[in-house]
């Protein structure tokens, strides 16, 4: 799995997609979870609706609402009031059973003003061991990096 | 063991430039945010920087914002700080620490031993 | 700009004394405070984070409590190695800053 990267700013809400193949996770609940370690657990923020049917409907945990419209395959997770505890790594998993498969690999990150963080076009050079690539853009600061980049947690 | 050197320090004239380093090693430097934290002779501790794993988010103290810059480049496990139009009130002892959440935030866990910078006529 | 004030500035204290110094935020930063420990002529030690949670390797006679905007650090009983200065920081809400410090001193 790549890893995308969110950045939102403080004291706003940030809104995380997470797209995945709609016939292949049908039934499937979805879980939103946070990376504690390089080998530690996925530890469950928040999840769908258990009934499956009534995924659409908004569940929250704190600040941290989840929503996921089966049909057209995409989880979307708002962490509102962004702080700088809220960055880290996370995940979108879909549940089967005690079961959970990766969706989306995510690194949150917060910036304390929309002019403290630096274009794509103006990040660190990679070494040569590494890589980076724009891939896309889902939000204005939205991207992806290559497993190369940085090193990922196992999925758990 | 998890360890962070300092080095790059020196007496400097006011305006001038000074790039600071700190190496890191017994860790996985790219998991962690990294940062710079500085303390003028007699004085408390003022943070100055910090730098996101990936180095793409970065915050800066207004009192430096705009004259010091910094960088990581973790292939070489390393983190700068590069300082220009230095003033008198600059002078402090630099420390590089390790923010002790997993790609994120937290308390510095882990200090150098600080390197001195004197800006000074 | 969340402000931190630590009292004492200063505490003269006797080895195997308890020491109970004060952190206050000019507004709640939850319980994301850390304390920091500094010898002359050292770095900083974090001691304590999230408040309540011992570093790793500090012993059992530092402990920390509070949340919001008032926090405390107690050691239970004082040993000669513990006469430094003394951090608190917060790290809820940008620009992350830190009190001005308490001296612990003997007396």
């Known amino acids: 799995h790549n890893t995308t990267v969110f950045q939102g700013v403080e004291g706003q809400s940030l809104q995380v997609s997470c797209p995945y193949d709609s016939m292949k996770h049908w039934g499937r609940r979805k879980a939103w979870c946070r990376q504690l370690g390089e080998k530690g657990p996925c530890q469950r923020v928040v999840s769908t609706h258990n009934l499956w049917l009534l995924s659409f409907l908004r569940r929250r945990n704190g600040s941290t609402a989840i929503t996921d419209d089966t049909l057209g395959g995409t989880l979307t997770i708002t962490l509102r009031n962004l702080q700088p505890h809220d960055a880290g790594f996370y995940q979108c998993q879909s549940l089967h059973g005690s079961e959970a498969d990766t969706l989306r690999k995510v690194l949150v990150e917060v910036l304390a003003d929309p002019l403290d963080h630096r274009d794509a076009g103006d990040l660190w050079v990679p070494g040569e061991s590494e890589s980076f690539e724009d891939a896309h853009v889902e939000h204005s600061i939205s991207r992806s990096l290559l497993e190369g980049e940085i090193p990922f947690p196992p999925t758990s | 063991q998890v360890q962070l050197v300092e080095s790059g320090g020196g007496l400097v004239k006011p305006g001038g430039s000074l790039r600071l380093s700190c190496a890191a090693s017994?860790?996985?430097?790219?998991?962690?945010?990294m940062s710079w934290i500085r303390q003028a002779p007699g004085k408390g501790l003022e943070w100055v920087s910090y730098i996101s794993s990936s180095g793409s988010t970065i915050y800066y103290a207004d009192s430096v914002k705009g004259r010091f810059t910094i960088s990581r480049d973790n292939a070489k496990n390393s983190l700068y700080l590069q300082m220009n139009s230095l003033r008198a009130e600059d002078t402090a002892v630099y420390y590089c620490a390790r923010l002790g959440g997993y790609y994120s935030l937290g308390p510095m866990d882990v200090w150098g031993q600080g390197t001195t910078v004197t800006v000074s006529s | 700009e969340i402000v931190l004030t630590q009292s004492p500035a200063t505490l003269s204290l006797s080895p195997g004394e308890r020491a109970t110094l004060s952190c206050r935020a000019s507004?709640?930063?939850?319980?994301?405070l850390a304390w920091y420990q500094q010898k002359p002529g050292q770095a900083p030690r974090l001691l304590i984070y999230?408040?309540?949670n011992r570093a790793t390797g500090i012993p059992a006679r530092f402990s920390g409590s509070g949340s919001g905007t008032d926090f405390t650090l107690t050691i239970s009983s004082l040993e000669p190695e513990d006469f430094a200065v003394y951090y608190c920081q917060q790290d809820s809400a940008f620009p992350f800053t830190f009190g001005g410090g308490t001296k612990v001193e003997i007396k």
């Open positions: 999230d408040a309540s």
């Open positions: 017994g860790f996985t430097f790219s998991d962690y945010y």
């Open positions: 507004q709640s930063v939850s319980s994301y």
